[in-house]
Interface confidence: medium
């Protein structure tokens, strides 16, 4: 029998392709800088298939090397405002659990109003992930223009 | 026998491993906001491996969940230029078919020359992808500068 | 037996997932444009699993393509200043052997502080990846600022 | 082979108008942005004005910029410069440059050039 | 705008010698976006270098080009005697496309 036959037999968790990506919802109460995601195939584009959401932020399900990703758009922006309103800084960490609470990626958009990045990074089920948006501007909903995503890559 | 050795014997396109990075090749006509793009080993370091070309634009062959990626540099371009010209925009999207239409990814370049990004999304077989450059500003084809590709991630 | 219970009895190298991120660990001396990288646990979160370290320099292990991917943030840097020392830019490239050497991947900082991009490339073992980033001004170390890393994807 | 053949240059008094063509041959016109480049005797050459293989992006220089203007007929193979409201400062010999592709680097191909004298 | 400072503005050699050009920005030229012209009297500009380094069809090994930010050289290895000319660069990473005037290499 053919593997790729085979492969459709098993359950996909089983392979571990854990993949998340998410649209952002809203952003948090003041003082709280954490961006609040969503997924799922009723919002448009965005899916959850492992990780789950917790409150808003991704949690882990599944130890290994992850691919990270996040794109963020300044929702009124334009070179001026952006380095006016300087320094607007996104970073993406491990929040909890508290024990390996660590940032993995961070930028700042200096006179652009929008940042791209992506890294890979070990995690391990448990982690949630949070994304930090600090300054006085607000990301942009679109769904093309802001989203965060994460994609296991091997054990 | 291993699984490794298996693989093997398999062809790849059975394992779901569709896989395409393209290399510029012009842009469209007047009014045609389209990048049209080319592909394969004879252009470079460029391939298709399951997708294919349709008339310089994307075409999936195979339904999945795929990392989409794509840097665009401008080819006469210093902050200076590209805020004059502002806005120039990029935007990747399902182009064909029309029911399926819609904006992938989307990034202006403000006072920067180069926008790189990356999501994960869901694309299904016969899906075309566009890559819309509006403004007056064009690309560089530099092969370092300029690219666009996808990589099936899972079913 | 499940495929999942066989895929850990196999030593994933066999299954070709050659994967590494590093952090930075030092620029080069003076005229030598060339960034030096280093990775591994006792580091924090880098890694290499199959590709190697030579001199600070990142070489392939396995012929396949690559995902690779990149962010470079300056280390005293507002847009400012970016834009007085303007161009400082970024490639990545096959540096050894000779005979392969080419440019991947680059860009410009312009009136922005970090680049950070990705592509798909065809790699082969022993090809050794150097990132060169000219220019007066100099690199974060901070490893969620600054990293570099691949990605096996398929034969 | 490619070939830039100018044309319509000579003559013509201060704050008077000219029009150059370019006929083009050897190459796939459209595909490719153009430019006209000019050398006044004994100086350097200046980038005057660029234009997209559609037509559809013109860029000038700032000396010429709101004076002249580049335009295309891609069915006719040829590329035009309208000067207006000459100057002496715009004599010089006037090259059809060929871009090396569509999105404006480096010149590979020129032609021969055709001498505007602006002069009362 | 870069402007572009090409020197020596002249330069007296032989044939077989070897010639170093050199072209100056006054700002960095992007990602080696720099180019090298020959030009004959009553001759268009001709097409030497490209990228700062590559090599147009057709040119001889004999041209070579190196630099980048804002120091580029032309190097002619071994002068033949149809070498003698004028070399200008230019710069096409941003508008407006600016030329150095020239080096004039004349045979000694």
């Known amino acids: 029998q053919r593997f790729a036959q085979a492969q459709q037999q098993l359950p996909l968790e089983s392979l571990g392709w854990d993949v998340a990506e998410l649209q952002l919802n809203h952003t948090g109460p003041q003082q709280d800088p954490r961006l609040y995601w969503q997924g799922g195939p009723a919002l448009g584009r965005s899916f959850l298939h492992g990780p789950e959401l917790d409150k808003g932020q991704l949690r882990i399900h599944r130890d290994g090397i992850y691919m990270v990703h996040i794109q963020v758009t300044l929702a009124i922006c334009s070179s001026t405002t952006a380095s006016r309103h300087h320094p607007t800084t996104l970073a993406v960490g491990i929040c909890s659990p508290a024990s390996r609470s660590i940032s993995l990626l961070r930028l700042s958009f200096h006179q652009g109003c929008t940042i791209a990045s992506q890294r890979l990074t070990p995690l391990a089920r448990g982690d949630t992930l949070c994304t930090n948006l600090t300054g006085t501007l607000l990301p942009s909903r679109n769904t093309d223009e802001t989203f965060f995503g994460v994609q296991w890559v091997r054990p | 026998q291993r699984f490794a050795q298996a693989q093997q014997q398999l062809p790849l396109e059975s394992l779901g491993w569709d896989v395409a990075e393209l290399q510029l090749n012009h842009t469209g006509p007047q009014q045609d906001p389209r990048l049209y793009w080319q592909g394969g080993p004879a252009l470079g370091r460029s391939f298709l491996h399951g997708p294919e070309l349709d008339k310089g634009q994307l075409r999936i062959h195979r339904d999945g969940i795929y990392m989409v990626h794509i840097q665009v540099t401008l080819a006469i371009c210093s902050s200076t230029t590209a805020s004059r010209h502002h806005p120039t925009t990029l935007a990747v999207g399902i182009c064909s078919p029309a029911s399926r239409s819609i904006s992938l990814l989307r990034l202006s370049f403000h006072q920067g020359c180069t926008i790189a990004s990356q999501r994960l999304t869901p694309l299904a077989r016969g899906d075309t992808l566009c890559t819309n450059l509006t403004g007056t500003l064009l690309p560089s084809r530099n092969t370092d500068e300029t690219f666009f590709g996808v990589q099936w991630v899972r079913p | 037996q499940r495929f999942a219970q066989a895929q850990q009895q196999l030593p994933l190298e066999s299954l070709g997932w050659d994967v590494a991120e590093l952090q930075l660990n030092h620029t080069g001396p003076q005229q030598d444009p060339r960034l030096y990288w280093q990775g591994g646990p006792a580091l924090g979160r880098s890694f290499l699993h199959g590709p190697e370290l030579d001199k600070g320099q990142l070489r392939i292990h396995r012929d396949g393509i690559y995902m690779v991917h990149i962010q470079v943030t300056l280390a005293i840097c507002s847009s400012t200043t970016a834009s007085r020392h303007h161009p400082t830019t970024l490639a990545v490239g096959i540096c050894s052997p000779a005979s392969r050497s080419i440019s991947l991947l680059r860009l410009s900082f312009h009136q922005g502080c970090t680049i950070a991009s990705q592509r798909l490339t065809p790699l082969a073992r022993g090809d050794t990846l150097c990132t060169n980033l000219t220019g007066t001004l100099l690199p974060s170390r901070n490893t969620d600022e600054t990293f570099f890393g691949v990605q096996w994807v398929r034969p | 082979e490619v070939q830039l053949l100018e044309s319509g240059g000579g003559m013509v008094q201060p704050g008077g108008s000219l029009r150059l063509s370019c006929a083009a041959s050897g190459f796939t016109f459209s595909t490719y942005a153009m430019s006209w480049v000019r050398q006044a005797p004994g100086k350097c050459l200046e980038w005057v004005s660029a234009i997209s293989g559609s037509g559809g992006r013109t860029f000038y220089a700032e000396s010429v910029e709101g004076r002249f203007t580049i335009s295309r007929d891609n069915s006719k193979n040829t590329l035009y410069l309208q000067m207006n409201s000459l100057r002496a400062e715009d004599t010089a010999v006037y090259y059809c440059?060929?871009?090396?592709?569509?999105?404006?680097?480096?010149?590979?191909?020129w032609g021969q050039g055709t001498l505007v004298t602006v002069s009362s | 705008e870069i402007v572009l400072t090409q020197s020596p503005g002249t330069l007296s050699l032989s044939p077989g010698e070897r010639a170093t050009l050199s072209c100056r920005a006054s700002?960095?030229?992007?990602?080696?976006?720099l180019a090298w012209y020959q030009q004959k009297p009553g001759q268009a500009p001709r097409l030497l270098i490209y990228g700062a380094s590559s090599r147009a069809t057709g040119i001889p090994d004999r041209f070579s080009g190196s630099g980048s930010g804002t120091d580029f050289t032309l190097t002619i290895s071994r002068l033949e005697p149809e070498d003698f000319a004028v070399y200008s660069c230019q710069q096409y990473g941003d508008l407006p496309f600016t030329f150095g005037c020239g080096t004039k290499l004349e045979i000694k």
């Open positions: 440059a060929k871009h090396d592709y569509s999105n404006y680097p480096y010149f590979d191909y």
């Open positions: 700002q960095s030229v992007r990602s080696t976006y």
